[in-house]
């Protein structure tokens, strides 16, 4: 039994590291294999994490761990029974991949604007609280070719948009995603979209020529 | 040995201001978040705030928004907490606190006290 | 603010006997990441505190077995089997979960 591809991790950098690694061959992760990990500091124990498949000879760890600094370094330990496979070393701030935003909500209530919300993943004593900033995606469930994104650049997590800048009649869907920039991450997952009708009124001088009013960004 | 050591007690008039330090030794501060805790005389314990040293990223409690600043300077391995407009109420011990991610470490702690 | 009730605010134990605190969150104390970080302190007389007790349930380093925690949820006690002359002091229970993170008042534990 060999390692083919090494372990790679990514830090979600609050609580979870994944780690994804693959086998020379079919391999049953969670009964073959233990992955053992220990933080680089004082009184610090060895966990174990049990993997799980991902693809026939692909395997998957998901490690806990109780909070994160910029420093932090783990040392990683791949185990089959007795026999050591691979030894490595972590650092979660230099592969950090942030949680998805959640609770995205479009309020419509005001007529000619339109205003999203989401929740910032992070809670306030984490370091990525405070340096996120999202990527909103709107597109038509009508109109495969009517896509936008916002890069929304600042910390607050809301996005307000004119209702005329999309069709009104139809249906849209939003998503939001997540980054930061001082540990130059990877952007997160999507968050899960969030459907609604776009039913802004135009007055009649611009009825005819609501084709002008259509941005992408 | 793992130690925090504090500065020495602090007698200071009132509108004054007051820096006390703690120095790590047997670990790096980069390696945790360094706290500060509040103990009036014959009180208990209040948590104060805390700093991430590597980024210098501070949480303060919203009492202490504003009187405390808390920075760090890990070529020297020390933390610092700075109180200003200095009243009587401030007077009590400080102590400096590893936390990773529990308090396993504290300093022996500051007297400061506030008198004119 | 989570506010951290303790129960009683002293205690009087005769060596050997058991003892028992209580501590009260105000709300839930779990982490967002799945955690409840809820710790116990002893503050002996003229010294800093020391840890007992974190993560609820676990021993720290060096510390007696005579010494446990449990609960979830709010509510947390800290159990002491058989008393002895050197666990005099003020024990305090601590919510490391939400910012501001908060201490318990306080309970004294002295020996009849």
């Known amino acids: 039994m060999k390692v083919l591809q090494e372990p790679t991790c990514v830090s979600d950098y609050m609580s979870i590291s994944t780690c994804e690694w693959k086998m020379n061959g079919p391999t049953n992760c969670s009964t073959e294999l233990r992955l053992l990990y220990q933080l680089v500091f004082l009184l610090s124990e060895a966990h174990t994490c049990i993997p799980e498949n991902n693809g026939g000879a692909g395997c998957v760890c998901h490690l806990l761990m109780d909070d994160v600094v910029s420093a932090d370094n783990y040392t990683l330990d791949l185990w089959a029974g007795q026999q050591l496979l691979w030894k490595g070393s972590f650092k979660p701030s230099e592969h950090v991949k942030p949680r998805a935003p959640g609770n995205l909500t479009v309020h419509t209530n005001v007529s000619d604007t339109l205003l999203l919300t989401w929740s910032n993943p992070y809670p306030p004593d984490n370091y990525l609280y405070n340096h996120l900033t999202y990527a909103v995606n709107i597109w038509s469930e009508n109109d495969p070719a009517d896509f936008r994104i916002y890069n929304v650049t600042y910390l607050e997590p809301s996005l307000r948009i004119a209702a005329s800048t999309l069709k009104s009649g139809i249906s849209y869907r939003a998503r939001v995603r997540a980054w930061a920039q001082c540990y130059n991450t990877t952007w997160s997952e999507w968050s899960p979209s969030t459907k609604w009708h776009n039913s802004y009124r135009e007055p009649f001088e611009q009825h005819h020529h609501h084709h002008h009013h259509h941005h992408h960004h | 040995e793992v130690q925090l050591v504090q500065s020495g007690a602090e007698v200071k008039k009132p509108g004054a201001t007051v820096k006390i330090s703690c120095k790590a030794s047997g670990f790096n501060i980069k390696d945790t978040y360094m706290h500060w805790v509040k103990q009036a005389p014959g009180k208990g314990l209040e948590w104060v705030g805390r700093?991430?040293?590597?980024?210098?990223?501070?949480i303060y409690a919203s009492k202490f928004q504003g009187k405390v600043t808390i920075t760090a300077d890990t070529s020297s391995n020390t933390a610092y907490m700075e109180l200003s407009s200095l009243r009587s109420e401030d007077t009590a011990v400080y102590h400096c606190?590893?936390?990773?991610?529990?308090?396993?470490?504290w300093g022996q702690g500051t007297l400061v006290t506030v008198s004119s | 603010d989570i506010v951290m009730t303790q129960t009683p605010l002293s205690l009087s134990v005769t060596p050997g006997q058991p003892a028992s605190i209580s501590c009260r969150s105000s709300q839930s104390i779990v982490h967002s990441n799945g955690n409840t970080y809820l710790e116990w302190y002893l503050q002996k007389p003229g010294q800093s505190p020391q840890l007992l007790i974190y993560k609820v349930t676990n021993r720290f380093s060096g510390v007696p077995d005579r010494f446990s925690g449990s609960g979830s949820g709010t509510d947390f006690t800290l159990k002491i089997s058989r008393v002895e002359a050197e666990d005099v002091g003020v024990y305090y229970c601590f919510q490391g979960s939400h910012v501001p993170y908060t201490f318990g008042q306080g309970t004294k534990l002295e020996i009849k």
């Open positions: 606190v590893s936390r990773r991610p529990w308090f396993a470490y």
């Open positions: 700093i991430d040293p590597t980024n210098g990223y501070t």
